[in-house]
């Protein structure tokens, strides 16, 4: 498919001249940022960004790659080196420590320097590192965490927790010996480490005592409370704040976000992770875009500004399942949230960053025709005389071990939301990848986001832009329209 | 392996503060570029960059990812959308048209708008688009092409040729009907379309008549001249310029580059593509770094400046073979050439860009320990009870079809330069990938390289920076120290 206008060199020359004009007009804002938003696409490597762009375009009846994601419109781009101190290819815990706290840690640890050792409780104390969100709170800003995973998951936990094991969601997950040594589960830290104004995502079951039925799935014991300490953490959190509200469904969320008496909001919409966007019951669960909007409505009331973490956390899960359909539809919803946030904020006073914690062994090849489905087949046959998809994984669960032979695939099979793309190596979970990821930036001090940087740089740019510790002597003009 | 200094948060905080300091000091140069250099890593997607960084670091006895490639030091980064007008995943011909001419074309065509159709000679005329190199020459600059492939290959050909088929290296490759219609082979266009001051790479056999023995392999008929028209294109080229010299080995190249009487230099060091860096006979063939240095010595004599295209062209070939060792060692030599060029030029007057034409379905996963070999095994076993490598391909020739079962692999096997990493889909050649690639920029107007751009933007930035067509009214101050 060749669009006739693209056959004319003028089309490309005009377009490039316009892009050059925009580039020449770019003026680094010398003001401080009143607000900080970090959008984290978990597992959203560059291959995921491109594939999602094409899918988003095709959902709008375009050919695909010529369209723009919301993040594509951000004027500044850098590359971020994602390795953890102990691994070439990191996990979401060590990376969260890097981009939220500004310090690299070890694989599967959160909010701790690399002096802490995975799973060794006694290496926690004294090795805690403080997140930019925590520093923003100390500076009088409102702060929020929004995610499509459980709110106690590795990425959001980087904003508030310190743990040698990212899997310690509730106290039931913490070994008795570690509990005795004083190591707290992540859910406990969520409500006790710092005052978070807005908490939206999944993770209900970690907040309630064992035996507490889940409000949405009361007959499913496995979805009920998991806590062994008998604590109702939601109740404890509500008791801390006069204007606090807890919600567990979309209707309540939308009401609460418009209620001026609500100062603190916790919304936990699933017992564990939230449902994939394609499976979401839109009467019960809000989308990431809706959660982001609700958070911004509350947080933006603070004249001193806010810090907001927004995670498209299940991009990663789709990839781990080798189900690109899930990963890419999650990426599109993540991008929709970025777009909505852009409409609700001003780049005059809000530094917005979009990045990934790491990539995945996900590739998009095979020379497909422009306009063909991103989930489709490559032209020609493979050496085993079978068709193959343009999307593939290096490793993962897209395998059939029975007779060793790779299964054939049809266009209708590969287009299914349940289809698992094939992989070279059969694993029960596809793995992360270690290549650099993109950082997109817009707003005050966004121009500092440049070149190739350590992932830790992201936290430091945010702290500097908002004149937070350790950059309180930032020497930046107050942002326009500041009221503080 | 955990470096003890990295356990201390101060290590990361200091490092990030320094990076912030450098970012704050970045001042966009408002001058024009006297010189333009585009370094093209063919097939060098972001996963290749990261893996090469680790390998380069480990060759220096470091753990790997914390080290810097020369390209990592470039202050500005953008992402480039590489699709061709007709394909989501492009080839090196259509992409060369984009980044060298500023216009997107169709798969496997070169130097032509998308109105031209692959292999249809009669769609050539009237659809030619002019490269930045050609425009630089018209503006009085010296120009050069350096590559590790044959100089008639798709990427370098984008600088000087117009062809509906990238495979028409010599007239023997052009169908008689197309020859009759007036379509010229790429080798002919190399010497006749424009005056190129420096031409260095492979591709001897396309320049000489059939039956001409190759000077390096005189007994191998397949390496001798291929031309059917009886022309000796080297002789024709030498006759055009008083100070022209042709060389075919390293010794002659080094002599010629230091000879002030040489104004034009053609060095063709292999009959076809140059040898992989790991196979290069360093007494006979120069490295990419040496060719780059030789080119710069000649080109920099021109007070009006120069345009230089430098291609690490066999990164791509290593990937097509699913031999990551070859791809990554080629990338390191490419980076060494960038480093050397940086020492021989000034960023005050030279705009240097580093980019890729496209990526490959190459991934680096599996959670290997920091410091472990990039060519090594991932921790754990796969579901088929076998080991697996951290480097893998989505598709490609790293397969065994005999009994359908994936072969086991040992650390010593996977570390071999000949080892082919495994792939999900068995193909005789691994394919390109369609995700965005990085553009690294340094020098005058490098700040224009930002955000997410069409690949065409690269050519326009170069043209604008040097005030070439269509940006002669560029309104930029002459660069410091201009002598023209």
């Amino acid at each position: 498919i060749i669009p006739v206008e693209e056959e004319n060199p003028d089309f490309w020359n005009r377009q490039a001249a316009e892009a050059l004009g925009a580039a020449k007009k770019l003026q680094p804002a010398q003001t401080a940022a009143k607000n900080l938003i970090i959008f984290l696409g978990d597992g959203m490597g560059v291959s995921t960004v491109t594939a999602a762009r094409i899918l988003k375009g095709q959902k709008k009846d375009k050919l695909g790659p010529e369209t723009f994601l919301a993040m594509d419109r951000f004027p500044y781009v850098a590359l971020s080196k994602t390795y953890s101190v102990d691994k070439h290819v990191p996990d979401s815990g060590a990376t969260a420590t890097a981009y939220l706290c500004g310090v690299k840690g070890n694989f599967q640890t959160i909010g701790l320097s690399a002096a802490a050792r995975f799973n060794q409780c006694n290496t926690t104390r004294g090795n805690e590192v403080i997140s930019v969100m925590n520093r923003a709170k100390k500076a009088g800003k409102s702060v929020g965490v929004v995610t499509t995973t459980r709110v106690q998951h590795a990425s959001p936990a980087g904003a508030y927790a310190h743990t040698v094991n990212r899997n310690w969601y509730s106290d039931a997950d913490v070994p008795a010996s570690a509990r005795q040594e004083g190591c707290q589960d992540i859910a406990t830290q969520l409500i006790s480490n710092m005052d978070i104004d807005v908490i939206l995502g999944g993770g209900r079951k970690y907040m309630f005592p064992m035996g507490t039925p889940d409000p949405e799935y009361p007959d499913d014991y496995s979805q009920g409370g998991t806590r062994l300490d008998g604590k109702n953490l939601v109740q404890e959190w509500l008791a801390k704040h006069q204007g606090a509200r807890y919600v567990w469904n979309r209707t309540e969320l939308l009401q609460a976000s418009l209620d001026p008496s609500v100062t603190h909001l916790m919304g936990l919409f699933e017992p564990g992770d939230m449902k994939y966007e394609i499976h979401r019951d839109s009467t019960l669960d809000p989308s990431l875009m809706e959660m982001t909007e609700a958070a911004l409505l509350l947080l933006s009331r603070n004249p001193r500004g806010f810090f907001l973490f927004v995670e498209g956390g299940r991009i990663d899960h789709g990839h781990h399942e080798s189900r690109a359909y899930r990963a890419l539809t999650e990426t599109i919803m993540f991008d929709d949230a970025i777009e909505r946030a852009g409409q609700l904020t001003s780049e005059e006073d809000t530094l917005s960053l979009v990045t990934a914690d790491h990539s995945h062994v996900f590739s998009f090849g095979g020379y497909p025709l422009r306009g063909s489905s991103i989930f489709g087949l490559a032209p020609g046959k493979a050496r085993d005389r079978k068709a193959y998809t343009v999307l593939l994984y290096g490793n993962g669960p897209g395998y059939v071990l029975k007779d060793g032979a790779r299964p054939d695939v049809t266009e209708s099979e590969s287009g299914s939301p349940e289809y698992r793309q094939q992989s070279a190596v059969p694993l029960d979970g596809e793995t992360h990848a270690g290549e650099d990821v993109a950082v997109f930036a817009r707003g005050p001090q966004a121009h500092l986001v440049h070149g190739v940087q350590e992932q830790t740089f992201i936290a430091h740019v945010m702290a500097f832009a908002a004149c937070l510790e350790p950059y309180t002597a930032c020497d930046l003009a107050p942002r326009a329209g500041t009221t503080d | 392996i955990i470096p003890v200094e990295e356990e201390n948060p101060d290590f990361w905080n200091r490092q990030a503060a320094e990076a912030l300091g450098a970012a704050k000091k970045l001042q966009p140069a408002q001058t024009a570029a006297k010189n333009l250099i585009i370094f093209l890593g063919d097939g060098m997607g972001v996963s290749t960059v990261t893996a090469a960084r680790i390998l380069k670091g480990q060759k220096k006895d470091k753990l790997g990812p914390e080290t810097f490639l020369a390209m990592d030091r470039f202050p500005y980064v953008a992402l480039s959308k590489t699709y061709s007008v007709d394909k989501h995943v492009p080839d090196s011909g259509a992409t060369a048209t984009a980044y060298l001419c500023g216009v997107k074309g169709n798969f496997q065509t070169i130097g032509l708008s998308a109105a031209a159709r692959f292999n249809q000679c009669n769609t050539t005329r009237g659809n030619e688009v002019i490269s930045v190199m050609n425009r630089a020459k018209k503006a009085g600059k010296s120009v050069g092409v350096v590559t590790t492939t044959r100089v008639q290959h798709a990427s370098p050909a984008g600088a000087y040729a117009h062809t509906v088929n990238r495979n028409w290296y010599s007239d023997a490759d052009v169908p008689a009907s197309a020859r009759q219609e007036g379509c010229q082979d790429i080798a002919t266009q190399l010497i006749s379309n424009m005056d190129i001051d420096v031409i260095l790479g492979g591709g001897r056999k396309y320049m000489f008549p059939m039956g001409t023995p190759d000077p390096e392999y005189p007994d191998d008929y397949s390496q001798g001249g291929t031309r059917l028209d009886g022309k000796n294109l080297v002789q024709e080229w030498l006759a055009k310029h008083q100070g022209a010299r042709y060389v075919w080995n390293r010794t002659e190249l080094l002599q010629a580059s230091l000879d002030p009487s040489v104004t034009h230099l053609m060095g063709l060091f292999e009959p076809g593509d140059m040898k992989y860096e790991i196979h290069r006979d360093s007494t006979l063939d120069p490295s990419l770094m040496e060719m780059t240095e030789a080119a710069l010595l000649l080109l920099s004599r021109n007070p009006r400046g120069f345009f230089l295209f430098v291609e690490g062209g066999r990164i791509d070939h290593g990937h097509h073979e699913s031999r990551a060792y070859r791809a990554l060692t080629e990338t390191i030599m490419f980076d060494d050439a960038i480093e050397r060029a940086g020492q021989l030029t000034s960023e005050e007057d030279t705009l240097s860009l580093v980019t890729a034409d496209h990526s490959h379905v190459f991934s680096f996963g599996g959670y290997p320990l920091r410091g472990s070999s990039i060519f090594g095994l991932a921790p754990g076993k796969a579901r088929d009870r076998k080991a697996y490598t951290v480097l893998l391909y989505g598709n490609g020739p790293g397969y065994v079809l005999k009994d359908g079962a994936r072969p086991d692999v040992t650390e010593s096997e996977s570390g071999s330069p000949e080892y082919r990493q495994q792939s999900a889909v068995p193909l005789d050649g691994e394919t390109h990938a369609g995700e965005d690639v990085a553009v690294f920029a340094r020098g005058p107007q490098a700040h224009l390289v930002h955000g997410v751009q069409e690949q065409t933007f690269i050519a326009h930035v170069m043209a604008f920076a040097a005030c070439l067509e269509p940006y002669t009214a560029c309104d930029l101050a002459p660069r410091a120290g201009t002598t023209d």
Epitope: D91, F107, Q108, F118, N119, Q120, T149, R150, H153, A154, R166, N167, A172, D173, G272, D273, H317, H320, E321, L401, L427, D428, G429, E430, T431 | G366, Y367, A378, P379, G380, K381, A382, R383, R385, A387
Partner: antibody, heavy 130, light 111 residues
Framework: QEHLEESGGGLVKPEGSLTLTCTAS?????????MCWVRQAPGKGLEWIAC???????TYYASWAKGRFTISKTSSTTVTLQMTSLTAADTATYFC???????????????????????WGPGTLVTVSS | QVLTQTPSSVSAAVGGTVTINCQSS????????FSWYQQKPGQPPKLLIY???RLASGVPSRFKGSGSGTQFTLTISGVQCDDAATYYC????????????FGGGTEVVVK
């Protein structure tokens, strides 16, 4: 040839402690395997006790073994099982076994699954009696 | 987790077929993290079948494993005298942590 050999068994009094050692030959512990302990009371079936992943030191225990039994890697070829508060019910042959470690992504986290036991030692008898 | 193995004892004539069942109280991980072992008196167990149905190296093809999730079967066709032993099933589970369980064993007597 790959072998496992247990040592340290013998007679121990009730409430006493004992440490068993498993020594590997022909291979060294790596990220490809878990090292585990399984026991078998006289005339009874097999009972899993614990496993350790040598790569990161992660340990997993049967619920009944938590607190009383501790598995450790002491070198690249030895693992130990420390047993405390022993009772007559702990009388058994204790086997050291190797299990394949498969990467898995479970419950939102990374792990290596303990799969089948592909290599066993001959066992060492522990008798708890006064 | 409970793995119920039936029968606890079975006798078979040479050349006959033996079927042993194993039922799990919950699904094993990935529905196929399931193995079968053979143990002879005074010896450690020996792996026969892994991943529910795959034959371990050197194991004769008369041993066959099948099943998925919670129900698994070991079938020995063309029983030989050397097959007299006790057979154990084993499953791998995940619930916040990995754990393993063995069945109670089935003694196979060959007549």
């Amino acid at each position: 040839q790959e072998h496992l050999e247990e040592s340290g068994g013998g007679l121990v009094k009730p409430e006493g402690s004992l440490t068993l050692t498993c020594t590997a030959s022909g291979f060294s512990f790596s990220s490809s395997y878990y090292m585990c302990w399984v026991r078998q009371a006289p005339g009874k079936g097999l009972e899993w006790i614990a496993c350790i992943y040598p790569d990161d030191g992660n340990t997993y225990y049967a619920s009944w073994a938590k607190g009383r039994f501790t598995i450790s890697k002491t070198s690249s070829t030895t693992v130990t099982l420390q047993m405390t508060s022993l009772t007559a019910a702990d009388t058994a042959t204790y086997f050291c076994a190797r299990a394949l470690a498969y990467y898995a992504y479970v419950d939102g986290g990374h792990s290596y699954a303990i799969n089948d036991f592909d290599l066993w030692g001959p066992g060492t008898l522990v008798t708890v009696s006064s | 987790q409970v793995l119920t193995q039936t029968p606890s004892s079975v006798s078979a004539a040479v050349g006959g077929t033996v079927t042993i069942n194993c039922q799990s109280s919950q699904s094993v991980f990935s529905n196929d993290y399931f193995s079968w072992y053979q143990q002879k008196p005074g010896q450690p167990p020996k792996l026969l079948i892994y991943d529910a149905s795959r034959l371990a190296s050197g194991v004769p093809s008369r041993f066959k494993g099948s099943g998925s999730g919670t129900q698994f079967t070991l079938t020995i066709s063309g029983v030989q005298c050397d097959d007299a032993a006790t057979y154990y099933c084993q499953g791998t589970y995940y619930s916040s942590a990995w754990y393993n369980a063995f069945g109670g064993g089935t003694e196979v007597v060959v007549k």
